[in-house]
Interface confidence: low
């Protein structure tokens, strides 16, 4: 059509210049378009140089939109993580502070001469919470054994108990010198800390996945399709035509096919995180136990003082008469030791509020990956509000007829807009799917009260989570899988935990 040859390119010139490109690239009037490599080759206002500049620009715009979405999601997850993580750390810090304030007056030198043992216990609990690969049951057992040894020496300074130590250690389980406190703390702490740390870790892994997926480059085929979607209408001389909705969805479903494959495991992870929050409440819940460690320690020392005479008699009976230390003072106590009655502090409602907010956010972001194409089309791609004869269909102004593809890589086999090789999934995204699976399995294990090792997350992620857990007093002690002296470095520890902190050499 000769008339179209003389059509002015002023509108395109204005748009092109606004993007910061040189106006000298733009022809005054339409030219023949055989040189075009992406846009339809009719009469056009775009030179090769313009087409490439706009292709670059459209890709950068999509990448920028993707990064914006990712950053917003990461910010949401980080807010939840920091709020809940800070709360759990504060509970443990408050427990230790209460112990440091109350124990000296109540227990005298039974506490003051053993502050190191108590401080070390809290340090280990802190490490464990933050993801260190240590065995909590063994850590607690070591603490009680060490404490018993030291307190026995203090209670019987006139004896020479060194010969006794082996015997005392062997008798400890039968004698139960600290009453029920060690067993109760072991059962409750393992489940509480596992629940708390796995939830916070889950938020960390989710955020990490989003960050890594945001770094996946768009395929060249996608770049062509995005250019065609966003700017070929300008080159074609219909700059006012906005992309047809279904056309935009097909382009972005093709471009983000690999990302949509995260959907199933992403949902599984978020479901497991919502579920684990059940373990935060009640007398054996994370809040009560982590904030009440000092209560069980006080119970233990109270029990030891109550049982002191019976205990000594039983030890003599089991281990023989001890030698007397001629330089040692008698069993009289240097300072009066009292009993300490501590109440668990009532919940402030802070955690309930934090968890309620986190659960709402987790539900909101469940369909993030599959809704991404639609969201970007609506919010970033200037998509036409309706599919009609006036929208841009990639070739001209007119209705877009192809059907909308399903979600994910496999469904793109016949995508008319983006050539997607469905036999070549993106390896970064496959790795992130595996990370989601591994974390979900940990959360399922944690729900059953299992002490989950936070090892290198490159394991195969297999194994099934247990069911609904078991009441505190019916869960038996597990056999240690690894000695607490062979602790591995962490790759997925909680924020702030360095590799050195995650290791402990024997």
């Amino acid at each position: 059509d000769p008339a179209s040859k003389s059509r002015s390119c002023s509108e395109v010139r204005q748009i092109y210049g606004a993007k910061g490109f040189s106006l000298s690239d733009v022809p005054q009037a339409e030219i023949s378009g055989e040189h075009l490599r992406i846009c339809p080759q009719g009469y056009t206002c775009c030179t090769s140089e313009m087409e490439e500049n706009l292709a670059n620009h459209s890709r950068m715009e999509l990448e920028s939109a993707l990064h914006d979405s990712s950053r917003a999601l990461q910010a949401t997850l980080a807010t939840q993580l920091h709020g809940i993580d800070d709360h759990f750390q504060r509970l443990l810090n408050d427990s230790e502070r209460t112990l440091q304030e109350a124990f000296p007056g109540a227990f005298g030198d039974l506490y003051t001469q053993n502050t190191r043992a108590f401080r070390d216990l809290y340090a280990e609990l802190r490490l464990y919470y933050r993801g260190a690969n240590l065995h909590l049951e063994e850590t607690l057992a070591e603490f009680w054994a060490r404490l018993l040894e030291r307190l026995f020496k203090q209670l019987h300074p006139q004896l020479l108990p060194d010969d006794y130590l082996d015997c005392l250690g062997k008798q400890a389980e039968a004698l139960r010198p600290f009453g029920d406190a060690p067993r109760e703390l072991r059962l409750r702490a393992t489940r509480a800390f596992v629940a708390a740390r796995s939830f916070v870790q889950g938020l960390g892994v989710a955020s990490d996945v989003v960050r890594k997926v945001a770094q996946v480059p768009l395929a060249p085929e996608c770049s062509r399709a995005i250019m065609k979607l966003v700017y070929c209408a300008h080159c074609r001389g219909v700059p006012g035509a906005r992309p047809c909705p279904d056309y935009c969805r097909n382009v972005l479903k093709g471009c983000l096919a690999n990302q949509a494959d995260l959907d199933a495991e992403w949902r599984n992870l978020l479901d497991s995180m919502v579920l684990i929050t059940d373990k935060f409440w009640g007398p054996s819940g994370a809040e009560s136990v982590i904030g009440g460690v000092h209560v069980w320690l006080a119970e233990a020392i109270n029990a030891l003082q109550d049982n002191k005479d019976t205990l000594t008699a039983k030890v003599i009976q089991a281990c023989g008469n001890p030698k007397v230390n001629p330089h040692g003072s008698g069993p009289e106590e240097k300072r009066r030791r009292g009993k300490l009655a501590l109440q668990e502090k009532p919940s402030t409602g802070t955690l309930e509020k934090l968890v309620s907010e986190a659960k709402a956010q987790l539900r909101d972001i469940q369909d993030f990956w599959i809704s991404l194409p639609g969201t970007l089309c609506s919010e970033k791609m200037a998509m036409s509000p309706a599919s009609d004869d006036r929208c841009w269909n990639g070739i001209s102004k007119g209705r877009y007829l192809p059907e909308v593809m399903g979600d994910g890589l496999a469904n793109q086999i016949n995508n008319p807009e983006v050539e997607v090789d469905i036999t070549k999934p993106d390896m970064t995204i496959r790795q992130q799917i595996m990370q989601l699976k591994i974390m979900t399995n940990r959360l399922r294990g944690a729900y059953g009260g299992n002490d989950v090792d936070f090892q290198d997350a490159s394991d195969d992620g297999s194994g099934s989570g247990s069911g609904g857990g078991c009441p505190d007093d019916t869960c038996g002690r597990r056999v240690s899988k690894k000695s607490s002296s062979s602790r591995t470095p962490l790759t997925h520890a909680l924020p702030g935990l360095s590799e050195q902190e995650g290791q402990k050499t024997s």
């Epitope: 490439e52 670059n56 890709r59 480059p217 768009l218 395929a219 060249p220 036999t423």
Partner: antibody, heavy 125, light 109 residues
Framework: AVTLDESGGGLQTPGGALSLVCKAS????????MGWVRQAPGKGLEFVAS????????AYGSAVKGRATISRDNRQSTLRLQLNNLRAEDTGTYYC???????????????????WGHGTEVTVS | VALTQPASVSANPGETVKITCSGS????????YGWYQQKSPGSAPVTVI????KRPSDIPSRFSGSTSGSTATLTITGVQAEDEAVYFC???????????FGAGTTLTV
């Protein structure tokens, strides 16, 4: 005129590390992707690494991935290649090369080279 | 993914020479190619075509580039003795997400 001057080559020991520097002049350095291409004696050209104009995107050839780090200083107009754990097969001439434009994530860098340095020889022995 | 080039091509002065470069396998990735001339081993390459069809200002107009699908062609119209060299094509390897070069074609005039 565009000039690219490589330095840092020479005799290197296996297992050691190499640091090559390319000093650029004659063009607005910060606007262009840059990279390194090498050539073993008697062999063809091999892509080593590329970096986008602002330094945010990098790409590495499969033979050096995990051992190489490409970086740039736009104020000094310098390009750097750090190559660790050197092997005999890293021997060759290393060329610094300028790209006409970094299209997107530099994925097509090897198709857009419009200027080359004279090269610096590296021998790992 | 590999870029396939003929090992050698020969021509008489004044003839038109075409050197091809094809992306193999299920390669549908890049649609940009560059052509680089190396006159002797160890001498620096010279770009004759970049970005499929762009020619640096100091390269004679007898050099041109074109593409069709995943195949690029370097055409030298009216080849001259000084064009004798090894010609490498360069493109993109999607599997490794990085640059890739063909093995080179020796042009004998």
């Amino acid at each position: 005129a565009v000039t690219l001057d490589e330095s840092g080559g020479g005799l290197q020991t296996p297992g050691g590390a190499l640091s090559l520097v390319c000093k650029a002049s004659g063009f607005t350095y910060s606007s262009y992707a840059m990279g390194w291409v090498r050539q073993a004696p008697g062999k063809g050209l091999e892509f080593v690494a590329s970096i986008s104009s602002d330094g945010s995107d990098t790409a590495y050839g499969s033979a050096v991935k995990g051992r190489a780090t490409i970086s740039r200083d736009n104020r000094q107009s310098t390009l750097r290649l750090q190559l660790n754990n050197l092997r005999a097969e890293d021997t060759g001439t290393y060329y610094c090369a300028k790209s006409y434009r970094c299209s997107w994530n530099c994925w097509d860098y090897a198709a857009k080279i419009d200027a080359w340095g004279h090269g610096t020889e590296v021998t790992v022995s | 993914v590999a870029l396939t080039q003929p090992a050698s091509v020969s021509a008489n002065p004044g003839e038109t020479v075409k050197i091809t470069c094809s992306g193999s396998g299920s390669y549908t990735g890049s649609y940009y190619y560059g052509w680089y001339q190396q006159k002797s081993p160890g001498s620096a390459p010279v770009t004759v075509i970049y970005n499929n069809n762009k020619r640096p200002s100091d390269i004679p107009s007898r050099f041109s580039g074109s593409t069709s699908g995943s195949t690029a062609t370097l055409t030298i119209t009216g080849v001259q003795a000084e064009d004798e060299a090894v010609y490498f094509c360069g493109s993109y390897d999607r599997s490794s997400d990085s640059g890739i070069f063909g093995a080179g074609t020796t042009l004998t005039v």
